[in-house]
């Protein structure tokens, strides 16, 4: 999947655009908003009716090297009595993000953009029930 | 991808850090995943904390379209299909990396940008405090 060119007619390619070899693009990995602190709701993962745990995956050849993945703790959902209700389902909610992958080929290194699917949390859903004949 | 020769010390000296600027292949690696969450699942309608999806479009960003979730209710849907306000619908937020055209409007020059998106909603049982 290629990154689309700027297709809008009102865009003029500025003179200041850096020269880039064909088939590639220049990427500055100094992240915009890197230090922006977000106030996430405190421990929603354990107060949710579809609670989840977090696992950190680490890969030195990926940027960022740390990616956090969520896993639903239960198949069912937690009811008002604190018990698991298996008539409901805990399901993962996923979001795509971009990472930069470093590849080594002999004494050379190349970089590739990669889409990664991250599980960010879980939600409780009413299952669709089919009765099989 | 685009290969960059390593420094003369190769293979002994391995640079652990990523360089500040890299040349990357225009092709993005990974299964052509479905970027429209409405098509990929109907959890947003079946959840006890349902949400609506709003399209956020920005031609200076890749991906140019990002879907933002907004919880439909303050409370959660109970077994009778009514909103139970003793529970909370809470957005699940995630920081993601996108590409920002830099300088603006340049077709093949980007910078990584971190943005916060609401991906969906979950139902939460709040701890209750009575204020004296």
């Amino acid at each position: 999947r290629k990154i689309p060119k700027v297709g809008h007619t009102f865009f003029q390619k500025p003179e200041s655009c850096p020269p880039v070899p064909g088939g590639s693009m220049k990427l500055d990995i100094g992240i915009i908003n890197e230090n922006q602190r977000v106030s996430m709701s405190r421990n929603i993962e354990s107060r949710s009716t579809s609670p989840w745990n977090y696992t950190v995956t680490w890969d030195p050849n990926r940027y960022p090297s740390e990616v956090v993945q969520a896993q639903c703790r239960n198949l069912g959902c937690i009811n008002a009595q604190g018990k698991e209700d298996i008539s409901m389902n805990s399901v993962p909610i996923q979001q795509e993000t971009l990472v930069v992958r470093r590849k080594h080929q002999g004494c050379s290194v190349s970089f590739q953009l990669e889409k990664v699917l991250v599980t960010v949390g879980c939600t409780c859903v009413t299952p669709v029930i089919h009765h099989v004949q | 991808g685009i290969t960059i020769p390593r420094n003369p010390g190769c293979p002994n000296s391995e640079d652990k850090n990523f360089p500040r600027t890299v040349m990357v292949n225009l092709n993005i690696h990974n299964r052509n995943t479905n970027t429209n969450p409405k098509r990929s699942s109907d959890y947003y309608n079946r959840s006890t904390s349902p949400w609506n999806l709003h399209r956020n479009e920005d031609p200076e960003r890749y991906p140019s379209v990002i879907w933002e979730a907004k919880c439909r209710h303050l409370g959660c849907i109970n077994a009778d299909g009514n909103v139970d306000y003793h529970m909370n619908s809470v957005p699940i937020q995630q920081e993601i990396l996108v590409l920002r055209r830099e300088p603006p409007h340049c077709p093949n020059s980007f910078r990584l940008e971190k943005i916060l998106v609401s991906v969906g909603c979950t139902c939460v049982t709040p701890i209750v405090h009575h204020v004296a």
Epitope: - | K70, L74, N88, V90, I127, V128, H129
Partner: nanobody
Framework: EVQLVESGGGLVQPGDSLRLSCAAS????????FGWFRQTPGKEREFVAG????????EYANSVKGRFTISRDNSKNTVDLQMDSLRPEDTAVYYC?????????WGQGTLVTVSS
């Protein structure tokens, strides 16, 4: 710790209006929503109205829709409930609620009596 100060309760006649106010102070950051419940003797507390902090989305109980209006002032961490066309069945103790997603704070309540 979070403090909630409710005001505006009192005795009014049917058809009259009343405005309830609630001010939050202390560590009231990351607000999810702010609103009001009410309770009459021997009954459970019922939701009246709520306003989401992030986008001012409002929700009302069916029994008050079209008569009550909830509004907020972000800069002051306050929420107001404008109650119009009051009915005898609106008589209750009204509780301010501050919701921080995983923690919820209840005020002490203010009495509203609608009687001729």
């Amino acid at each position: 710790e979070v403090q909630l100060v409710e005001s505006g309760g009192g005795l009014v006649q049917p058809g009259d209006s009343l405005r309830l106010s609630c001010a939050a102070s202390g560590r009231a950051n990351s607000i999810n929503w702010f609103g009001w419940f009410r309770q009459t003797p021997g009954k459970e507390r019922e939701f009246v109205a709520g306003i989401r902090w992030s986008d001012a989305y409002t929700e009302y109980a069916n029994s008050v829709k079209g008569r009550f209006t909830i509004s907020r002032d972000n800069s002051k961490n306050t929420v107001d409930l404008q109650m119009d066309s009051l009915r005898p069945e609106d008589t209750a103790v009204y509780y301010c609620v501050l919701d921080l997603s995983t923690v919820r704070y209840w005020g002490q309540g203010t009495l509203v009596t609608v009687s001729s």
